[in-house]
Amino acid sequence: KLTIESTPFNVAEGKEVLLLVHNLPQHLFGYSWYKGERVDGNRQIIGYVIGTQQATPGPAYSGREIIYPNASLLIQNIIQNDTGFYTLHVIKSDLVNEEATGQFRVYPELPKPSISSNNSKPVEDKDAVAFTCEPETQDATYLWWVNNQSLPVSPRLQLSNGNRTLTLFNVTRNDTASYKCETQNPVSARRSDSVILNVLYGPDAPTISPLNTSYRSGENLNLSCHAASNPPAQYSWFVNGTFQQSTQELFIPNITVNNSGSYTCQAHNSDTGLNRTTVTTITVYAEPPKPFITSNNSNPVEDEDAVALTCEPEIQNTTYLWWVNNQSLPVSPRLQLSNDNRTLTLLSVTRNDVGPYECGIQNELSVDHSDPVILNVLYGPDDPTISPSYTYYRPGVNLSLSCHAASNPPAQYSWLIDGNIQQHTQELFISNITEKNSGLYTCQANNSASGHSRTTVKTITVSAELPKPSISSNNSKPVEDKDAVAFTCEPEAQNTTYLWWVNGQSLPVSPRLQLSNGNRTLTLFNVTRNDARAYVCGIQNSVSANRSDPVTLDVLYGPDTPIISPPDSSYLSGANLNLSCHSASNPSPQYSWRINGIPQQHTQVLFIAKITPNNNGTYACFVSNLATGRNNSIVKSITVSASGTSPGLSAGA
């Protein structure tokens, strides 16, 4: 079907448009273009008879049209009046007519917009401002930008009048920004210059600086006042209620004790008509006082609280110094000094931060020291320790257990045997014990200040016979050439000898074997697969002896370099190829094969029936031990010859 495509569909005034013809029939006599949706001789633009190779302009020809042999029509220097439909009338050689209509729209190139405002100096929290994008243009879209960003979502921002007007209700100082509007139509987009909104605000409550309120006699007093305000505030100073001067700064040289008093700064905004005041009390000392330390927390809790130590009083133009444990401050990320060195902050205090702390004020002649301050850091209780560490006793001896837990204030202790409370003491003493005294001995430590409690339980066995020992290990699956293993013979018993056997033999001499802890612990450094043996420990005293059950060490190793069998590398065509891969590994490895780099199957055996020369190539076996995280591989070249071409070839499996 004959169709007309307008390129582009939306055309800017002054530009050009191509009415492109699709599916033009073959065997044409000629064609003619018309303005409008129908064939009308009075509105003919141009006609073309192919056989004459000549085009004839019609009544609607403007000189801006160019016709092409493929019937497409180019219209140049487009004007608004060109908008609309265009009809192509095609006459075929058999004199059958065909028509198609296309259209395009013409839009003006937009002018640069500008912003008008209904209020050039709005007052904060009081006025609204309406910005309007000029000029009003038909078929144009209006957009707004604030600081070159699209409009934020805000209930105080409202678009109206087809987005041509942007209203800001209840303006705030934060609305002081660059505002731009943009006009768009299908052919152009233009942005205005920015308009800066000037919001009148303030004054806010003024701030007087510097903050220090203590001065020494003879110093200069120089106070500055500032209040956020637009336009900038006008300032006035009052001393003890009496007006002094209308300046932002107040300067009094060589002050005396008589200059002590209340100093008021008043800020006034002439446009908003608002006033705000701030008062500071200034104290002038005859001589520098002895400094003293104040703390914001007298009983800080370890690892929880921070403590701020402040050197008082605050005196202008003074150097503050600090000492901890009679030393200057150590470098520590937990110690922070304020800009004026007057405040020392200890972040996340520890029990080691008790001090003593001293501060000093340096004057012309000497340094005045404060009295030392010691921090009372509350901590603990830590896990209590029960001593001695023995767990086996013989009947008839005295049992004397002592409990200790680091704590501030000192912990309160309680003893329980088999869950039953015994006494509230730090030590537990039982004379002439019997088998009946065997059981669970619990020490409970309690910190009354923090409310925290911690307990430790110890199993005590009273027996003439030594128990059957057992072996505990710090690593149940060590990796070869990487890990160490420590075996410990349990339990720990009084007046007892500990012995070790490996595979039923006494310990071999080896630099990798080490006994410690009264021979109770056996450590194997850098284990190897040969260390995977049966380990037994024994205990003995003057009355009895006993041995543990054997513990077999499970050493993870490998995979070693795999071996592919059979070793043959030459095969006859038609034979079966049956390759098996094996690698020493614990645990057993995962196997996979690749032929010429292409992954095959995840099996230990690779089987290919009736091989041909196409099966020539490199056969790689990959092994991987997930436990050790190690991998290995081997590559074998296989050659397959056509039957009977080479002597000594394997027939395969």
Partner: antibody
Framework: QVKLQQSGPELKKPGETVKISCKAS????????MNWVKQAPGKGLKWMGW????????TYADDFKGRFAFSLETSASTAYLQINNLKNEDTATYFC???????????WGQGTTVTVSS | DIELTQSPSSLSASLGGKVTITCKAS??????IAWYQHKPGKGPRSAHT???YIQPGIPSRFSGSGSGRDYSFSISNLEPEDIATYYC????????FGGGTKLELK
């Protein structure tokens, strides 16, 4: 881009025949007619006629009927001007020029000089 | 047949100046007129076509006007490369050239 490339200069004797070529490129040859223009030494341009490259039909100006023949080799996108029984007054530069659909000449060849001398 | 009378046959002008060439037809040619610039040893090239609105490659210094039988072609702000012979052409089913105007530098 559109280009019309004409053959080189010719030196002929009176009574002989000359055939000059104009090879077109950069457009579909059969879409536009081809004109021939003569410029005798020291004279102005003179339109000789044109050939319809679609139908092959030639049109000759009155002064160029008889000894002059326009022809085509469409497959080679080439137009030819043949002058038979050359005379001394045929000494001139001959231009081929493509005719836009609106009939004015939009592209020209560089010209071929024909000299007729005994 | 339509005849075109082009004048002047030659013309001297200064660089930066303006020149005007006229062409008079023996009858109304309905603005079917084109102007060509011809330099020795080269093929002529379009200088202006009155019927066509936009002509790529033609300097804006070149302009044409006229209707009925009388037509003119002007070059403003003359430049060295404008020195050539200029012809008017009436184009229709049959074509007619004017006699040419040789433009020289003063």
């Amino acid at each position: 881009q559109v280009k019309l490339q004409q053959s080189g200069p010719e030196l002929k004797k009176p009574g002989e025949t000359v055939k000059i070529s104009c090879k077109a490129s950069g457009y579909t040859f059969t879409d536009y007619g081809m004109n021939w223009v003569k410029q005798a030494p020291g004279k102005g341009l003179k339109w000789m006629g044109w050939i319809n490259t679609y139908t092959g039909e030639p049109t000759y100006a009155d002064d160029f009927k008889g000894r002059f023949a326009f022809s085509l080799e469409t497959s080679a996108s080439t137009a030819y001007l043949q002058i038979n029984n050359l005379k001394n007054e045929d000494t001139a530069t001959y231009f081929c020029a493509r005719k836009d659909l609106l009939r004015y000449f939009d592209y020209w060849g560089q010209g071929t000089t024909v000299t007729v001398s005994s | 047949d339509i005849e075109l009378t082009q004048s002047p046959s030659s013309l001297s002008a200064s660089l930066g100046g303006k020149v005007t060439i006229t062409c008079k037809a023996s009858q109304d040619i309905n603005k079917y007129i084109a102007w060509y610039q011809h330099k020795p040893g080269k093929g002529p090239r379009s200088a202006h076509t009155l019927h066509i609105y936009i002509q790529p490659g033609i300097p804006s210094r070149f302009s044409g006007s006229g209707s009925g039988r009388d037509y003119s072609f002007s070059i403003s702000n003359l430049e060295p490369e404008d020195i050539a012979t200029y012809y008017c052409l009436h184009y229709d089913n049959l074509h007619t050239f004017g006699g040419g105007t040789k433009l020289e530098l003063k």
